[in-house]
Structures are given as structure tokens and as C-alpha cells.
């Protein structure tokens, strides 16, 4: 397991909500990404491929999420001070081998200016 701070902007604020960006290498084909708040799993997304190369995307703990070819974004809405915490992107790489787990994260600071607009986007 590799642990570290995200070396990119992990939190993007929008109208009282936050987009948490979890990046992974372009070469990764199949993986599980979990968003952890402290030690608790908030959200997850798993991408696998079958023998016909068909993609399957699953979420056991569903959050609004968005998948690109090198990141998963998880969206949290209606921010309040209780959201302030360490958040971690827990990436399990299935393919290509070898199996590997990486953990990157950062602290989400909540400021009054980010709580002004309770709009969903």
C-alpha cells in the first residue's frame, strides 16, 4: 500500500457542494476507487471488463460520481462544518497487474464562504 498526499487539487467547490477528485494512472484498465472520510467508506466505484472487453461499472456505496479515463470524481452536497475532515482516495488496481493499493488524501477545510449557497448542481 502506498500512502501520500494528493499532489493535485483534490477539492473543487461549487455552490455549497464539493467535487472530490480521485486520480489514477491512464494505463489502469480495471480498478476499485473508494472515497474514505477518516476511516469510513463514503462512496465507491468499481470498473471491470469482461472477456469481450465490455465495461462494467458498479457502486456498492453510491454517491453521485463521474468517471473519466484518469479520474473518478465524487460529489458531496449541502456542505456544513461536519464535512471538515481528512478524505482519502483508496485505489485498488486490478489491471494491469500486479495488484496494488494506493491511498492519497487531503484535509477538506470548510469556510463560511463555501456554505453560502445551498444549491445542488
Amino acid at each position: 500500500e502506498i500512502n501520500g498526499s494528493a499532489n493535485y487539487e483534490m477539492f473543487i467547490f461549487h455552490n455549497g457542494g464539493v467535487q472530490i477528485l480521485c486520480k489514477y494512472p491512464d494505463i489502469v484498465q480495471q480498478f476499485k476507487m473508494q472515497l474514505l472520510k477518516g476511516g469510513q467508506i463514503l462512496c465507491d466505484l468499481t470498473k471491470t471488463k469482461g472477456s469481450g472487453n465490455t465495461v462494467s461499472i458498479k457502486s456498492l456505496k453510491f454517491c453521485h460520481s463521474q468517471l473519466s479515463n484518469n479520474s473518478v470524481s465524487f460529489f458531496l452536497y449541502n456542505l456544513d462544518h461536519s464535512h471538515a475532515n481528512y478524505y482519502f482516495c483508496n485505489l485498488s488496481i486490478f489491471d494491469p497487474p500486479p495488484f496494488k493499493v494506493t491511498l492519497t488524501g487531503g484535509y477538506l477545510h470548510i469556510y463560511e464562504s463555501q456554505l453560502c449557497c445551498q444549491l445542488k448542481f
Epitope: 494505463i27 484498465q29 472477456s51 472487453n53 462494467s56 494491469p96
Partner: antibody, heavy 116, light 111 residues
């Protein structure tokens, strides 16, 4: 240790048969699963696959519309419902685990004989 | 559907000698950095066993006398020093798209 154990049988042309495959030694619900068949003395032919929770299924053109793949993750079991069977469906049917980039575990196979 | 062909149909090689099997696909199996091509070994009376994936990566526990090479449409499985336990039929297989298909197989025997 991964184990896949199939069951099959003898059936008449036009008849139906359900194959089952009992899986153990791994988290069944984490893997796509497939059926591959092999006619006596012939090569390997892919039949069908199913994703981790059964929401995606794919079929070979030879069996589409006649065969249905399904799974019961609570019972760790894969199924193949075969209808309108023909003599040319006679083969050893293998249950296989798609291990992300290859069929990494195979059952011993079950012989399905379609004969009158 | 992608058609897989193999050559030769069969070959007999002396113990300790090199065996080479060729596989050709009717369209390229290369996507990004990966060739979606696997090799399987099937010994008499047994189910197949995964040997090589992504054209050149040996599966866990596969002896290093087995190697895979090639890209695009042309692939090769090489057994550098044939052992008695290598007598089997070898199949190439693609998972580039659906339906995945196997080659017809190459039978390897001892000369």
C-alpha cells in the same frame, strides 16, 4: 484454492437442460464468469459471459436466443439454461472465471450429450 | 467477429529444443498499450490453463521457458526448451471485443 464444479447430463434434440457451476475459494461476486465449450476432439469455443451482479450478459452467435446465462451470488453458483438443443451442442462445457485479463480458473468440465 | 488462425496445426520437437507457435488475428488486437491476446495450454483429459496474457506477460506460476511476443495481428508463443510435460494443445485467444474467439489450436508432441 479456487474450485469450479459443473454438473450436466444427457438430453434429446429439441430438449432443455440447465447446467450449474458451484464456485468456492474466492469472492464469487467480484468476478465476471463465462461458459466455454469443447466438442469431442475439437477446439475451444466461447459460449457466454455474465458480469459480477448479472446485469450484463453476452452470448456467442451460435447460442444467442437459445441459451441464457445467470448467477446466484448468494449461492456462489453460475447457471446456463440451454433450450432447443441440437446435436451440434454436444460438448464438454467448462465454467471459467474471467480473472480480469484471462480465463485463470477452469472447472473440470461437464459433458452434455444431445442424442435421441 | 475476429478470426484467429494458428500455425502449424501440429509440431513435433525433440526434448530440450525450441518450439514456436504462431497466431494471427483478422484485425489488430492492440488497444492503447495492450494487445488483448492470451495463450492457453490444454493437456490431454484436462481443462485449459492460462499461460500468457496481454501477448507477453506470463501468468503466475508459469515456467520462464514459455514466452509470448508480437503485436497487432501477429503473435508467437515460444517454448525455449521443450519438456515432456509440455505435450499439449496450445490455443491463442483474443478478448479485444465480443465475441471473444479462440484459435483452432496447435498440438505439440515430442519427436
Amino acid at each position: 484454492e479456487v474450485q469450479l464444479v459443473e454438473s450436466g447430463g444427457l438430453v434429446q434434440p429439441g430438449g432443455s437442460l440447465r447446467l450449474s457451476c458451484a464456485a468456492s475459494g474466492f469472492t464469487f461476486s467480484d468476478y465476471w464468469m463465462d461458459w466455454v465449450r469443447q466438442a469431442p476432439g475439437k477446439g475451444l469455443v466461447w459460449v457466454s459471459n455474465i458480469d459480477e451482479d448479472g446485469s450484463i450478459t453476452e452470448y456467442s452467435p451460435f447460442v444467442k436466443g437459445r441459451f441464457t446465462i445467470s448467477r446466484d451470488n448468494a449461492k456462489n453458483t453460475l447457471y446456463l439454461q440451454m433450450n432447443s438443443l441440437r446435436a451440434e451442442d454436444t460438448a464438454v462445457y467448462y465454467c471459467t472465471r474471467w480473472g480480469r485479463f484471462g480465463f485463470d480458473s477452469w472447472g473440470q468440465g461437464t459433458l452434455v450429450t444431445v442424442s435421441s | 467477429d475476429i478470426v484467429m488462425t494458428q500455425s502449424p496445426d501440429s509440431l513435433a520437437v525433440s526434448l530440450g529444443e525450441r518450439a514456436t507457435i504462431n497466431c494471427k488475428s483478422s484485425q489488430s488486437l492492440l488497444s492503447g498499450s495492450f494487445n488483448y491476446l492470451t495463450w492457453y495450454q490444454q493437456k490431454p483429459g484436462q481443462p485449459p490453463k492460462l499461460l500468457i496474457f496481454y501477448a507477453s506477460t506470463r501468468h503466475t506460476g508459469v515456467p520462464d521457458r514459455f514466452s509470448g511476443s508480437g503485436s497487432g495481428t501477429d503473435f508467437t508463443l515460444t517454448i525455449s526448451s521443450l519438456q515432456a510435460e509440455d505435450v499439449a494443445v496450445y490455443y491463442c485467444h483474443h478478448h479485444y471485443n465480443a465475441p471473444p474467439t479462440f484459435g483452432p489450436g496447435t498440438k505439440v508432441d515430442i519427436k
